[in-house]
């Protein structure tokens, strides 16, 4: 299931905890991984009393749950932290909640930002 060589990917980066982790708040992240490991992008968010709070976006290491997913779609019905992952450059720009049990699809569009590159 590996690709022989870790493919470099770029993902949208965001970190709500950027000050404490001493990183940029947002930008682009160049992904680096091990040989024979796949690389993914991800997004995670919380629903605080009806308000969607984006918490993190970036690169995600080899995870079979993310294989061959071109779009970032969270499928858990009502988690504490919504999580989606996908394969393809910047595939985590838009993210969607589409519960497996059925229910409305909700897609979140990113606000326009001037990205900075993180490595």
């Amino acid at each position: 299931s590996g690709r022989g060589e870790a493919e470099t990917r770029e993902c949208i980066y965001y970190n709500a905890n950027w000050e404490l982790e001493r990183t940029n708040q947002s930008g682009l992240e160049r992904c680096e991984g091990e040989q024979d490991k796949r690389l993914h992008c991800y997004a995670s968010w919380r629903n605080s009393s009806g308000t969607i709070e984006l918490v993190k976006k970036g690169c995600w290491l080899d995870d079979f749950n993310c294989y061959d997913r071109q779009e970032c779609v969270a499928t858990e019905e009502n988690p504490q932290v919504y999580f989606c992952c996908c394969e393809g450059n910047f595939c985590n720009e838009r993210f969607t909640h589409l519960p497996e049990a059925g229910g409305p699809e909700v897609t979140y569009e990113p606000p326009p930002t001037a990205p900075t590159l993180l490595t």
Epitope: C59, Q80, F83
Partner: antibody
């Protein structure tokens, strides 16, 4: 089932460093953040910091900033917590704890058995 | 940092009693709150998360309520195994903080 197995008890002298390990099994190691929490004798629980095993990024409580280093080895599904410049007040049971959620922090659904670190001259 | 204050610090009760432990946050934590049970020499055990969700495998006599700054853990009918120390924890924002603990002892 999820298991977190920590290294054994340590006795250290003031000024020394200690490195505690926590080996995870029963789940996808890189998918869930890992926390370190300690409990000093007769005291409550104190959060020390967090590591994201997927990328290795860390966040430490201000109290431990500059003295604590959390690392991980994805090949062995192990996280490490190193605390330097030990003093007697660092005598405590140190726990690793797995986060319940993916991609961000939340509560802890599995804990290691704890490692007693005693700092004494 | 968000301060978490539990009351009472110690609680004496008997088997079969209904007991309530309160946890107050110094600022809103929405419903990002968990409760843990600690026993000497054992790993802490998650009881409640997201203020009111019962962790899988935890007996239904445990329940949690509250939001924003005030939360309660209730044990509807105390069992011998429930005598322990209980901690609340907020995970609304870094740093994650715990209450000082409530020791539940046999009367």
């Amino acid at each position: 089932q999820v298991q977190l197995v920590q290294s054994g008890a340590e006795v250290k002298k003031p000024g020394a460093s200690v490195k505690v390990s926590c080996k995870a099994s029963g789940y996808t190691f890189t998918s869930y953040y890992m926390h370190w929490v300690r409990q000093a004798p007769g005291q409550g629980l104190e959060w020390m910091g967090i590591i994201n095993p997927s990328g290795g990024s860390t966040s430490y409580a201000q109290k431990f900033q500059g003295r604590v280093t959390m690392t991980r080895d994805t090949s062995t599904s192990t996280v490490y917590m190193e605390l330097s410049s030990l003093r007697s007040e660092d005598t405590a049971v140190y726990y690793c704890a797995k986060d319940q959620s993916r991609g961000w922090y939340s509560n802890f659904d599995s804990w290691g058995q704890g490692t007693l670190v005693t700092v004494s001259s | 940092d968000i301060q978490m204050t539990q009351s009472p610090s110690t609680l004496s009760a008997s088997v079969g009693d209904r007991v309530t432990i309160t946890c107050r946050a110094s600022q809103t934590v929405s419903n990002w709150l968990a409760w843990y049970q600690l026993k000497p020499g054992k790993a802490p055990k998650l009881l409640i998360y997201k203020a009111s969700s019962l962790e899988s495998g935890v007996p239904s006599r445990f329940s949690g309520t509250g939001s924003e700054t005030e939360f309660t853990l209730t044990i509807s009918s105390l069992q011998p195994d429930d005598f322990a120390t209980y901690y609340c924890q907020q995970y609304h924002s870094y740093p994650i903080t715990f209450g000082q603990g409530t020791r539940l002892e046999i009367k």
